[in-house]
Each structure stands twice: as structure tokens, then as C-alpha cells.
């Protein structure tokens, strides 16, 4: 969490951002909130990116002002116009690219004063893993698949019954480049599993951590998946 203040004490407002991550090819949100003003026409929002000459986005007098917008963000940005009046300056970024990663500044001007805060934005790819029984294998085998990851993640298997066990000798993980030549499909196979035990396939890179669980019993297969973004620090 980054909280920024204006330069002069009497004319400063608090601006708060949250470090976040974008999934390439999908839409992302750069979060920023500020002390709201009564009049929308008195609020100016500027989003800037370190190393980029033009603006990422500008909103003033109740509407977008994109004449100074940098080419790399053309047609890809929007604020939540109806929420600006309540202090939401968050930016929606369409079709996130790897190159969108970096340090952003959310700069706010209102009738109360000015304020800004920086935001670290990471980009990569992350997806939910699905763990299934592999029926093509000769022994009791599980197969964990996740369609899109970048950078290359680590894959670790764990089990509820054998807590702390190292499954690296009885598992095999492969990474297959997807058609756009950036993200990769993750496939990990775990051999010699037993019933009535919950197995977890944990995939992690510096952006996200995802877990797929499976438990096979005589009467059913229970599955659960979970994905968590890392380093979502507020400032």
C-alpha cells in the first residue's frame, strides 16, 4: 500500500495505490483511491508511467482528455467515470502486454489540493490448474495442467497424508510454449498415488501462486482450485 501526500501540507490530499499484477492478453486494473471532492468538474486524474513521455491517461472536467496520451496506451485505458466522484481513480488497462510492467504514478488534483502515489505493476501470465486422474498411465497417476504461465513457474506436489514429503522423484513436469510464443502450458504428472489422500499441485512464479487439489475415494473425486496474486502491496 502506497499512500502519497501533496507537496504543501495545507493543500495536500491522500492518494492510495495498491501494487498489482496483470495477466497478459487480458484486462487489468491499476488501483488508486483519493479523498473525494464534491464537484466532479474540480477533479483531475493523471496516470503516468516511468520512462514513458506521454500520459497513460488523463481525466478532467468529468471526461477523458486523451490529447497527451502516449501511443502505447492508445485505445487501451479507461477510468471508472461514475466512481471518480467517490474517490476512485483506478485505471482499467485493456489487453495487458508484457511491456506494460513498470512504475506508474497516480496523480490527483482536487479543490482540496494535490497528491500522488506510485504503483508497481507486474505483468505475466497465470491460470488455474486442473488436476485430473490420468487413465492412460500404467499406475495410479495424477495429471496437473494449467494453460498459461509466464515467467516459467516452479511446480511442487504435496499431499495431506505425507506432509513434508518430496515428490520430485515420482513426478515429471514439462513446459510447452503456446502459439503466441510467450506463455507456456504447464503439465505435471504425479505417479504412484493412493486413494483417500488429498494431493496438491502448486504452481508459482513471482506474480502468482495457484493450487489445484484432488482427492480420490472409492465413491467420488473431489477437486478444488485456488489462485492468489503475489506482492499485492498497498502504498
Amino acid at each position: 500500500l502506497i499512500i502519497g501526500f501533496g507537496i504543501s501540507g495545507r493543500h495536500s490530499i491522500t492518494v492510495t495505490t495498491v501494487a498489482s499484477a496483470g495477466n497478459i492478453g487480458e484486462d487489468g486494473i491499476l488501483s488508486c483511491t483519493f479523498e473525494p471532492d464534491i464537484k466532479l468538474s474540480d477533479i483531475v486524474i493523471q496516470w503516468l508511467k516511468e520512462g514513458v513521455i506521454g500520459l497513460v491517461h488523463e481525466f478532467k472536467e468529468g471526461k477523458d482528455e486523451l490529447s497527451e496520451q502516449d501511443e502505447m496506451f492508445r485505445g487501451r485505458t479507461a477510468v471508472f467515470a461514475d466512481q471518480v466522484i467517490v474517490g476512485n481513480a483506478s485505471l482499467r488497462l485493456k489487453n495487458v502486454q508484457l511491456t506494460d510492467a513498470g512504475t506508474y504514478k497516480c496523480y490527483i488534483i482536487t479543490s482540496k489540493g494535490k497528491g500522488n502515489a506510485n504503483l508497481e505493476y507486474k505483468t505475466g501470465a497465470f491460470s488455474m490448474p486442473e488436476v485430473n486422474v490420468d487413465y492412460n498411465a500404467s499406475s495410479e497417476t495424477l495429471r496437473c495442467e494449467a494453460p498459461r504461465w509466464f515467467p516459467q513457474p516452479t511446480v511442487v506436489w504435496a499431499s495431506q497424508v505425507d506432509q513434508g514429503a518430496n515428490f520430485s522423484e515420482v513426478s515429471n513436469t514439462s513446459f510447452e510454449l503456446n502459439s503466441e510464443n510467450v506463455t507456456m502450458k504447464v503439465v505435471s504428472v504425479l505417479y504412484n498415488v493412493t486413494i483417500n489422500n488429498t494431493y496438491s499441485c502448486m504452481i508459482e512464479n513471482d506474480i502468482a501462486k495457484a493450487t489445484g487439489d484432488i482427492k480420490v475415494t472409492e465413491s467420488e473425486i473431489k477437486r478444488r482450485s485456488h489462485l492468489q496474486l503475489l506482492n499485492s502491496k498497498a502504498s
Epitope: V133, Y135, E140, I195, V216, T217, E218, S219, E220, I221
Partner: nanobody, 122 residues
Framework: EVQLVESGGGLVQPGGSLRLSCAAS????????MHWVRQVPGKGREWVSR????????SYEDSVKGRFTISRDNAKNTVYLQMHGLRAEDTAVYYC???????????????WGQGTLVTVSS
């Protein structure tokens, strides 16, 4: 209550054929893989064949491949084992059983019927 009732066994000459049936009740048949297991009198049980819930995937123990065919009729909650080219070593009590997956370790199976005896002899 899970019930599995096997039928269709009998005495057959070597090279002959039989069709075993297993009528299932007490559970949602289409949620389960169905398996055939056999037991030679005085010996342990041996897995024979399996079929997926929708019938699209089947597999067999090596010694019966090409001779036995597993099938199922989900409308009738019944699984079948068609046996051709029977040999003396196929003599056994045949059981059907269910499991949530295609895994087929004998110790995983919990529900058994009374079995049906197949005797191959001249």
C-alpha cells in the same frame, strides 16, 4: 445400498463363448467406472477389465486382450463382459465392481456381488 448382481456364467468348452451381465443398483450408475475382476478358486483376485462412465474408454488385462469385450448399457444400469476364445485358465468366479476412477488396484474395490462361476473344460 449398493448392489451388484452378476449372471451368465456356466460350463463352456475351450474356444467357446459366454456373455456375463452385472445389474447394478443403489447408486448413480453413470458416475462410476465399472470393472470386472476374477478369482480362481484358492487364489487371489485378478483385475480383468474396466469401462468409463460413458462407455467411451475401455481397457483390459493383457491375457484377455482381443478375446474379451466390456460394454455397458446406462439405461439399464448394466455392465457386460463378452468372452470369446475361452481357455482353461479363464476358469474363475467373475465379479463386477465399481470405482470412482479407472484405477484398478484390487484393494481399492469395496463393493462386491456374489459372483458368477465360469468353468472352461472339455
Amino acid at each position: 445400498e449398493v448392489q451388484l448382481v452378476e449372471s451368465g456364467g456356466g460350463l463352456v468348452q475351450p474356444g467357446g463363448s459366454l456373455r456375463l451381465s452385472c445389474a447394478a443398483s443403489g447408486f448413480t450408475f453413470t458416475d462410476f467406472w465399472m470393472h470386472w475382476v476374477r478369482q480362481v478358486p484358492g487364489k487371489g483376485r485378478e483385475w480383468v477389465s474396466r469401462i468409463s462412465p460413458d462407455g467411451s474408454s475401455t481397457s483390459y488385462e493383457d491375457s484377455v486382450k482381443g478375446r474379451f469385450t466390456i460394454s455397458r448399457d446406462n439405461a439399464k444400469n448394466t455392465v457386460y463382459l463378452q468372452m470369446h476364445g475361452l481357455r482353461a485358465e479363464d476358469t474363475a468366479v467373475y465379479y463386477c465392481t465399481r470405482f470412482s476412477t479407472g484405477w484398478h488396484r484390487i484393494e481399492y474395490f469395496q463393493h462386491w456381488g456374489q459372483g458368477t462361476l465360469v468353468t472352461v473344460s472339455s
